[in-house]
């Protein structure tokens, strides 16, 4: 391979998406960003939900959308499966609604493959322990 050949995968530079089981991505991401700095700007708005802990899969799910997994073997980035999206949405949408906000259209679960197969590769994500949602009023997540 010559130096002039474009690298297929790039290191993930967004710290909240490091150490999640894969470490390279390829832009554009699944919402159309070409630069990781643009992805980062939007990702930071989800920190309250991540810290609140509405879903143990939320961070992995968001990262799989904003910095999807890349592998040298496959030309297309690998994002989340629809099942993981639905699981996260089911647990986190009520928290967003408490704030007075809707589930983001950019995270519409119908955009993602229902399950991982040879035709539509996607990440199932880590298992989401089925514990009850916190009973604490989620108006100000992270408040002590």
């Amino acid at each position: 391979f010559g130096d002039e050949e474009e690298r297929r995968c790039d290191p993930i530079r967004i710290s909240m998406c490091q150490n999640l089981g894969y470490n390279v991505t390829k832009m554009p991401n699944l919402v159309g960003h070409e630069l990781q700095t643009d992805a980062e700007l939007q990702l930071t708005t989800f920190t309250p939900l991540i810290q609140y802990g509405c879903s143990s899969q939320l961070q992995f799910f968001l990262c799989s959308v904003y910095v999807p997994m890349c592998t040298e073997k496959i030309n297309i980035p690998i994002g989340p499966c629809g099942g993981m999206c639905l699981s996260v949405k089911r647990r986190c949408e009520p928290v967003l609604k408490e704030f007075g906000f809707a589930w983001p259209e950019s995270l519409n679960c119908s955009k993602f493959p229902p399950q991982n197969d040879h035709n539509h590769m996607c990440m199932e994500g880590p298992g989401d322990e089925e514990v009850p949602l916190p009973h604490k009023t989620p108006i100000q997540p992270g408040e002590e």
Partner: antibody, heavy 119, light 107 residues
Framework: EVQLVESGGGLVQPGGSLRLSCAAS????????MHWVRQAPGKGLEWVAY????????YYADSVKGRFTISADTSKNTAYLQMNSLRAEDTAVYYC????????????WGQGTLVTVSS | DIQMTQSPSSLSASVGDRVTITCRAS??????VAWYQQKPGKAPKLLIY???SLYSGVPSRFSGSRSGTDFTLTISSLQPEDFATYYC?????????FGQGTKVEIK
């Protein structure tokens, strides 16, 4: 109740420095990115900088890069904007603003603090 | 940087009028657009997020829509308290950028 209160504005000579503070209450600063937006007299809104203290991200508008530094002290629940090498064109009301969770708009703003750069 | 070109820069209208303000992004910003209302000496207030979602507590006479890179804020029936300056904002690309504002004045 969520509140953002800015302070530290005032009159400063060109080339001088000023530090603005944004005291947050009603939520934990570590859970949110915080932004500074400014508005020159009679003009529109200009985004200045943001910090995500939880992840350590900062980002600046080109117009202030290298002169302004954004920081946060989560123990005091306060964000700061250190402004150095101030210019006449930095004269503005400076607002701190909190982004809506999981969305792309500012749902809470401070009342603003006026910075005047003049000799 | 992404340019958000807002028009008109000012308009005169009467109570009860339907008012439309437009913002055009210099390239696609998806639906990551918000609209704000600002009155003299006050901080801006969020009206619309994600191009078309009404923020909690905002009267239903305000609405937002998107067509490609064109974004529209509509006030269906202008009320006396709506005379103010309105700004659009994109949050798709860094840096965040605002439109130059539209001042809605009493005719």
């Amino acid at each position: 109740e969520v509140q953002l209160v800015e302070s530290g504005g005032g009159l400063v000579q060109p080339g001088g420095s000023l530090r603005l503070s944004c005291a947050a209450s009603g939520f934990n600063l570590s859970s949110y990115s915080m932004h500074w937006v400014r508005q020159a007299p009679g003009k529109g809104l200009e985004w200045v900088a943001y910090i995500s203290s939880y992840y350590g991200y900062t980002y600046y508008a080109d117009s202030v890069k290298g002169r302004f530094t954004i920081s946060a002290d989560t123990s005091k629940n306060t964000a700061y904007l250190q402004m150095n090498s101030l210019r006449a064109e930095d004269t503005a009301v400076y607002y701190c603003a909190r982004p809506a969770p999981g969305h792309w708009g500012f749902d809470y703003w401070g009342q603003g603090t006026l910075v005047t750069v003049s000799s | 940087d992404i340019q958000m070109t807002q028009s008109p820069s000012s308009l005169s209208a009467s109570v009860g009028d339907r008012v439309t303000i437009t913002c055009r992004a210099s390239q696609s910003v998806s639906s990551a657009v918000a609209w704000y209302q600002q009155k003299p000496g006050k901080a801006p207030k969020l009206l619309i997020y994600s191009a078309s979602s009404l923020y909690s507590g905002v009267p239903s006479r305000f609405s937002g829509s998107r067509s490609g890179t064109d974004f529209t804020l509509t006030i269906s029936s202008l009320q006396p308290e709506d005379f103010a300056t309105y700004y659009c904002q994109q949050w798709y690309y860094a840096p965040i950028t605002f439109g130059q504002g539209t001042k809605v004045e009493i005719k």
